[in-house]
Interface confidence: low
């Protein structure tokens, strides 16, 4: 079969090259001489020439040693063609998998790692993690599987096995008790990473373990009581800086303060952070305070250190009394965004809704209203009551101002505080549809043949919403029904216009009346270009030539008929002079129709 199983080739092969790997063979070689070729990265595209194929025998050749860490798999295609160059087989996938050799040593990510641990910690305490990588394969072989070990520890006090390293993860932990910073402030560990899961090549690095001072002094507030004044509503306002002293090593985790609000902040209004330089607790507002709801907050703040206490110590607590200062607050519309349903086209002066705001301040401030943004200029707002009325015609179908049936208005409320403040609200008028648009056909110009004419399908559109739309009804007016028929389809959303009588080539007005489900009627004039042609037409062809007449007698008869027709036409013009001019074409067409009929008889 024209199939090759995946081929495994070890990296770093010694040759000799070219080295035969596998033979491509097509069973079509019984019928014709076959020539073999390969394509793909490693053959005819970069890295070119790694692989080749003996053209006539099909032997797949390796031209040089492979490097798995560079390319771990090659995907080639084998081709077989006959002597005349015609392909005799579909291209065949050839997968060449480069198998790993342990040709890389592990490498630590750093030459020196640094970690720290508190003095006096219990065995099992994690100190740090070191990492080594190996480019070799660690999935299918152990070539890249790294095992960690500690080669040596300096100094060896109180003994030489103070630390251990997890052979797989590289996590260094305390294994013995007795870490004493005063005796040994720092240990240097020589660490090893060995591939083959501990049986292969080894590399070394250094891990420095700093022994930290234990946190045996608690931070203390100085002073313990604070008083602060904060304007209401301000977020991120610095309320107070709380100062602590700590006898532990400055700028160490045992000295750096961590502050917590432990009481008095049920509303979660405050937050406290540690200033990175001064170590002070910076108390700020997380939410705006509300003078009207609570004019004073008594907070209890506790301070600890970044590092846990090494011995049992009392945790200091400070009291912060926060006085809230009153400020004039902006009126707030209730709700901030109000949705009101209103019928389009309501009379001018008709009330739409009342939209009012509330003032958060305790004083009974007067609120006045005005419209801030009314794109179409349809509304007015009473400054005292907040009553919104229509001053223009609300039109749901106005695409410039109305989106998805919604007309958006922004209103403003202003109090009479000192200084005055303003608040805005959004009024979303959902315009309820009324049947104020009749249906219209599209297109309004048609071209049609006067012989075997194709029915013209016109789409019907109505700007209104259901139920003021389909099903539609169609009717021809102003005598258009003499020559035309109009029929609405079963779905009720298109109208079919047909020519039912012969008309001569010319342009005609078809008066089409369409009405919707709510009986809203719309008259549209369709401009119909009638052409001298059969069946379908886009534009009229050149002047229409009738069938050739018979002999001379025929020609004479025609001449008589023409004279008679002219006389009749003159008579009709006199008789129906008052009749609408637009019918004139249809009269002429009728006369022509008589002529055509005679011509056909003559023929």
């Amino acid at each position: 079969d024209w199939v090759v199983a995946p081929i495994s080739v070890p990296e770093n092969g010694k040759g000799p090259f070219p080295q035969r790997l596998n033979q491509l063979k097509s069973n079509k070689d019984r019928d014709t001489k076959i020539f073999y070729s390969i394509t793909g990265p490693g053959a005819d595209s970069p890295p070119e020439g790694v692989f080749a194929v003996e053209k006539e025998t099909g032997w797949l050749l390796l031209n040089k040693p492979l490097d798995r860490e560079e390319i771990a798999k090659y995907e080639l295609f084998g081709h077989a063609v006959s002597e005349n160059g015609a392909s005799v087989e579909d291209p065949m996938n050839i997968s060449i998998i480069v198998t790993d050799q342990n040709d890389h040593k592990p490498k630590f990510t750093q030459d020196t790692f640094r970690g720290s641990v508190l003095e006096g910690v219990l065995p099992g305490t994690s100190v740090m993690q070191v990492t080594a990588t190996d480019e070799d394969d660690a999935i299918y072989t152990y070539n890249g599987v790294v095992a960690y070990s500690i080669h040596s520890q300096e100094p060896k006090d109180p003994h030489d096995l103070m630390f251990t390293i997890h052979r797989s993860t590289g996590t260094i932990s305390v294994i013995s008790s007795g870490l004493d910073r005063e005796k040994v402030p720092e240990y240097t560990l020589t660490i090893q990473a060995t591939d083959m899961d501990g049986d292969g090549s080894t590399t070394t690095a250094v891990a420095v373990v700093e022994i930290l001072d234990a946190n045996d002094n608690a931070p203390m507030f100085e002073p313990q009581k604070y008083e602060a004044w904060v304007p209401e509503n301000e977020v991120g306002h610095e309320v107070q800086r709380l100062t602590v002293t700590d006898l532990d090593v400055p700028n160490s985790p045992a000295w750096r303060a961590t502050y917590h609000i432990v009481g008095g902040d049920d509303g979660d209004h405050f937050t406290i952070t540690t200033h990175p330089e001064t170590n002070q607790g910076v108390l700020t507002t997380k939410k705006g305070l509300d003078f009207e709801a609570q004019d004073q907050h008594t907070l209890y703040v506790e301070v600890t250190n970044e590092a846990p206490f090494a011995v049992k110590l009392p945790t200091a607590t400070a009291t912060v009394v926060v006085h809230v200062k009153d400020v004039n607050e902006a009126p707030v519309f209730v709700p901030p965004s109000k949705v009101v349903e209103v019928q389009e086209g309501i009379p001018t002066g008709e009330p739409v809704c009342v939209y009012t705001a509330e003032d958060p301040d305790k004083e009974n401030q007067k609120i006045s209203y005005r419209i801030l943004r009314d794109p179409a200029g349809w509304l007015a707002m009473d400054p005292d009551s907040g009553q919104v009325t229509a001053v223009g015609t609300l039109d749901r179908e106005d695409e410039q101002f109305v989106r998805n049936n919604i007309y958006e208005v922004m209103v403003l409320a202003m109090d009479n505080g000192s200084p005055p403040t303003t608040g805005t609200g959004t009024l979303l008028l959902t315009l309820i549809d009324v049947n104020d648009h009749g249906p219209v056909p599209e297109p309004r110009q048609i071209t049609i043949c006067n012989q075997s004419p194709v029915r013209q399908v016109l789409n019907i559109t109505d700007k209104d919403l259901s139920p003021h739309t389909s099903p539609f009804q169609a009717q021809l007016t102003d005598d258009s029904d003499i020559y035309w028929t109009a029929e609405v389809n079963e779905e009720g959303d298109t109208v079919v216009l047909s020519l039912k009588k012969f008309l001569k080539q010319d342009t005609y007005d078809v008066h089409l009346s369409l009405s919707d489900h709510g009986n809203k009627e719309q008259l549209t004039v369709i401009r119909a270009t009638v052409c001298d042609c059969h069946g379908h037409v886009e534009t009229c062809p050149g002047p229409w030539k009738g069938g050739s007449g018979g002999g001379g007698s025929g020609a004479g008869v025609i001449a008589v008929i023409v004279v008679v027709v002219i006389a009749i036409v003159a008579g009709i013009v006199v008789l129906v002079i008052s009749r609408k001019k637009r019918m004139a074409k249809y009269e002429k067409a009728e006369i022509k129709e008589m002529g055509e009929m005679h011509r056909e008889l003559n023929a």
């Epitope: 008095g264 902040d265 209890y300 970044e306 590092a307 846990p308 607590t317």
Partner: antibody, heavy 123, light 113 residues
Framework: VQLVEESGPGLVAPSQSLSITCTVS????????INWVRQPPGKGLEWLGV???????NYDSALKSRLTISKDNSKSQVFLKMNSLQTDDTARYYC?????????????????WGQGTTVTVSS | ELVMTQSPSSLAVSVGEKVTMSCKSS????????????LAWYQQKPGQSPKLLIY???TRESGVPDRFTGSGSGTDFTLTISSVKAEDLAVYYC?????????FGGGTKLEIK
Amino acid sequence: VQLVEESGPGLVAPSQSLSITCTVSGFSLTSYPINWVRQPPGKGLEWLGVIWTGGGTNYDSALKSRLTISKDNSKSQVFLKMNSLQTDDTARYYCARSRGAYDFDGRGAMDYWGQGTTVTVSS
Amino acid sequence: ELVMTQSPSSLAVSVGEKVTMSCKSSQSLLYSSNQKNYLAWYQQKPGQSPKLLIYWASTRESGVPDRFTGSGSGTDFTLTISSVKAEDLAVYYCQQYYSYPYTFGGGTKLEIK
């Protein structure tokens, strides 16, 4: 160390309020926070709230709107007041002391508990 | 809020047997700054108030017999009674105090065969 709940009537009508007093001895309320915990009949424990040494409080969010914990340090008394009681508030109510005032003490753990007072909500 | 789940809900053992009960939290109770697990274990004997056995997940409260041992970290915790006595008949509750509101597990009822 002792905590004794002194309660009003054991029976409370629905929509009425409940008041319980916890009187402590052997330690100061300025040094130890006091928790309130309840246990419906045949069910598990439910933490209601805590009052810290400085008088600050934390409540279970579901009960916050109708629960008030206060204290009188000089009388060594802690008070629980709960409004708008319903039948599912029927339980044994305990006051319990935190191990200490500081995080280091494991102050969320409660080392001394009162004997509890039974409250039945029924019309 | 943090949800505490205890299992089994009840178990029956003979005097002298070793018993373990589990408590799982919906999030880690280990605080990285101090490497402490904010978990306590209580014992409630029939008709009595709860009694604190263990805090910080593994620290035995003074006066608690050393047959009671707490272990675990993060989200999985265990209370072990190395050799059950008849007086250990009770419901055992775990409780987290990592975040508000403090929450208890549903309890494990220990019965003596």
